[in-house]
């Protein structure tokens, strides 16, 4: 019996089609992705295979315009038109809050939405009974596949789950469920989630009765041959894990934004053991048409954007100076705006001993692209933030030890006074530079916020601390030369779309005048 | 509106076969599945299958394995239900009732009495 | 297959009366349980799903609860209308198996 598994996952509210690196998109003859694209190639898999299952591990939540204006309506809307089988919670899921989860998307998915490893508590309990599952059994042609659902146990550090929800460890919250399921004749079960490919290979490993493990998080790109775009595949696709009771487990994930179509085929015996499994994700390019009826669908939905893009967020009554010739030269007062509303967008965790998780932030000068003029009545829009933050990024949480810290501020000024855009602005820590040293020892001095401290002070960096930090993803991803990042970071979580975090916290203060207040000297 | 229509009632001898239909209107036949459900006389419902229209695929209760065929003809939007071998006591009322996204049955077809006797 | 106990059997009650029926599963069927109304010589409808989703159409006096194994059909305020007999269903998995059936009768 042969299954198709077509999955998506961390589409991070790319509803319309995107350039091919996920950005708006500007020549549509070269545009990729988009649930109107998307429809017409699962359509046509659809009409031409017997046992197909669309799912989704997680992440539609979070990361353009749609999501700031329609806040999960649009993901309910479109994915209900996809018809999808079943999604797995992602940890972006929970970034409006419990209930920015259950009115937009529990209440109105006309799609299970699972995950075996969260559990409420309290009041929340009886509110959200039934909204979510652990597990739903679905009839797949002559057949019953067990789909059971996986969530970051990280997501209340990513996100805003609240006090009551308990997000337990992945494997052994699916452990039972599985179990459940194969008493009850289930034999065939695909674990659907988002804890990323590491977690996804150790319950493929770790999880009996698993069959095929479908991820999210971490933007995995698999792949089988020679890649159709620019990612690099991080390993075969399917990738095969031997479980410990020694079956070959596919696991599966589909990079992230809609670029690509998760394309899985599963074979099965009658006792519903896994014979062989081969595919490919599938490039969304333009020689897929997008579907007419979806697009327009697409367009109606649009007019709502257009018209947000130019309503006041809240006030600025000093300039912003955005400006190249501060932001890649000194500290600008831009960027310390930039970095308080990353800061303030990771506020969560306090307890009897940390005031917050984190208080650090690094920002290339380079990704600060355009001034806010205050005389403008002091306006601020979000189409005044998308000319300073135009390339669609994220905020991301990292863990760096404070040597990897240390080598990349002396990489923020190695050939300083050439203007170019790894000089790093910042929030949470006070870094001097003697420019009259030799390139690789300019910081003589590194002092860090602490977050283990009831009154927050400036400490000396320790080189062997582990600390968090929230920079661009464009940072995390070794961009502007920052390779010592990628090649040494811990561990890296995808957070919120840019502009959203800035137009967030400027909506929050109402009225901001940042200052430039000797963070950098 | 959703509605389900039945074929009208029949009656079989002991041995025989009868093959009930259920037309389907006010939504897209293949985005839901049909189940069938049926009632004996006095008694309470019994669950038999499920089918998918868009490709035929069925589930069946194990107490009818072998007995019961559901099958589809969508350029009608049609489910049938044929069971064989009839005994006295598969003397019911047989329901279609459309499942809904989360394939709980939402609309049911009026029902068709069967009466086996010989 | 998972067994499902529906009490009472029979229940009379007045108009006007908050009315409860319940529905125990022999194990946790994960909120996936729908309720229905049966009236003399007529069809089911269904009221419920997912343990406490009120189908389009149904009156709000009409609600469901519980998790796990334990599952209850209130009627907040019954009206002669709602005489009639009340199943469970389980569609956690295969086979979907109903309650016995709940007589409801008006005093």
């Known amino acids: 019996w042969e299954l198709t598994i077509l999955h998506t996952n961390d589409v991070h509210s790319r509803l319309e089609q995107t350039s091919e690196d996920s950005s708006k998109c500007v020549n549509a003859s070269r545009c990729m992705g988009g649930v109107a694209r998307l429809f017409t190639k699962v359509q046509q898999i659809r009409r031409a295979e017997p046992n197909v299952l669309l799912l989704d591990a997680g992440d539609q939540y979070q990361g353009t315009i749609w999501f700031t204006v329609y806040k999960g309506a649009e993901v309910a809307h479109f994915m209900n038109a996809l018809r999808y089988d079943a999604m797995a919670l992602g940890n972006h899921e929970f970034d409006n809050g419990v209930e920015g989860l259950i009115e937009p998307l529990l209440k109105e998915a006309k799609f299970p939405i699972l995950s075996a490893n969260i559990k409420a508590k309290g009041p929340l309990a009886s509110q959200i009974s039934g909204l979510y599952l652990p597990y739903k059994v679905l009839p797949v042609g002559d057949e019953v596949v067990g789909i059971v659902g996986y969530t970051s146990k990280e997501t209340p550090f990513l996100s805003n789950p609240g006090t009551n929800l308990v997000f337990e460890d992945e494997i052994t919250a699916l452990q039972p469920e599985v179990d459940k399921l194969k008493t009850l004749n289930v034999n065939k079960i695909i674990a659907l989630g988002h804890s990323g490919f590491e977690t996804d290979k150790l319950i493929a490993q770790k999880v009996r009765g698993v069959d095929v493990v479908v991820g999210g998080h971490s933007n995995t790109f698999l792949y089988t041959g020679n890649p159709p775009s620019k990612e690099v595949p991080a390993g075969k696709y399917p990738f095969i894990v031997t479980s410990d009771d020694g079956r070959k487990v596919p696991v599966v994930q589909a990079y992230a934004f809609g670029k690509y179509l998760g394309y899985l085929k599963i074979e099965f015996d009658e006792r519903g053991n896994v014979i062989s499994s081969h595919g490919n994700p599938i490039l969304l390019n333009s020689s897929i048409p997008e579907d007419p009826s979806i697009k327009a669908d697409i367009n109606k939905w649009r007019i709502k954007l257009d018209n947000y893009s130019t309503q006041e967020l809240g006030k600025t009554i000093v300039y912003l100076d955005g400006s190249s010739q501060s932001c890649r030269f000194r500290e600008c007062n831009m960027g310390n705006l930039i970095c308080d509303a990353m800061i303030n967008n990771n506020l969560r965790h306090a307890d009897e001993m940390f005031w917050n998780h984190v208080s650090m932030c690094i920002l290339n000068g380079g990704g600060i692209r355009s001034p806010i003029d205050e005389r403008n009545n002091g306006t601020i829009t979000w189409e005044n933030l998308a000319a300073v933050l135009p390339f669609g990024g994220t905020f991301d949480l990292v863990q760096l030890k404070g040597s990897t810290l240390k080598k990349a501020f002396e990489h923020s000024v190695h050939r300083y006074g050439q203007s170019t855009g790894e000089f790093l602005q910042v929030g949470g820590i006070h870094v001097v530079y003697d420019l009259s040293r030799k390139p690789g020892d300019r910081v003589v001095k590194l002092d860090v916020l602490c977050t283990k401290c009831r009154v927050p002070s400036y400490d000396p960096l320790k080189m062997d601390e582990i600390y968090k930090v929230i920079l661009p993803n464009f940072l995390a991803n070794g961009g502007d030369g920052f390779q010592m990042i990628k090649d040494e970071l811990l561990r890296h979580d995808s957070g919120d779309q840019d502009i959203n975090v800035v137009s967030t916290y400027i909506s929050k203060m109402k009225v901001i005048y940042p200052a430039v207040e000797g963070r950098i000297k | 509106q959703v509605q389900m229509k039945q074929s009208a009632a029949e009656v079989r001898k002991p041995g025989a076969s009868v093959k009930v239909s259920c037309k389907a209107s006010?939504?897209?036949?293949?985005?839901?599945?049909m189940d069938w459900v049926r009632q004996a006389p006095g008694q309470g419902l019994e669950w038999m299958g499920d089918i998918n229209p868009n490709n035929g695929g069925t589930i069946y209760n194990q107490k009818f394995k072998g007995r019961v065929t559901m099958t589809i003809d969508t350029s009608r939007s049609t489910a049938y239900m044929e069971l064989r071998s009839l005994r006295s006591d598969d003397t019911a009322v047989y329901y279609c009732a459309r499942t809904n996204w989360d394939y709980a049955m939402d609309y049911w077809g009026q029902g068709t009495t069967v009466t086996v006797s010989s | 297959d998972i067994q499902m106990t529906q009490s009472p059997s029979f229940l009379s009650a007045s108009v006007g009366d908050r009315v409860t029926i319940t529905c125990k599963a022999s194990q946790d069927i994960n909120s996936q349980l729908s309720w229905y109304q049966q009236k003399p010589g007529k069809a089911p409808k269904t009221l419920i799903y997912?343990?406490?989703r009120l189908i389009d159409g149904v009156p709000s006096r009409f609600s469901g609860s519980g998790s796990g194994t334990d599952f209850t059909l209130t009627i907040s305020s019954l009206q002669y209308e709602d005489m009639a007999t009340y199943y469970c269903l389980q569609y956690d998995v295969f086979p979907r198996t109903f309650g016995g059936g709940t007589k409801l009768e008006i005093k």
């Open positions: 997912r343990a406490n």
């Open positions: 006010g939504y897209t036949f293949t985005d839901s599945n």
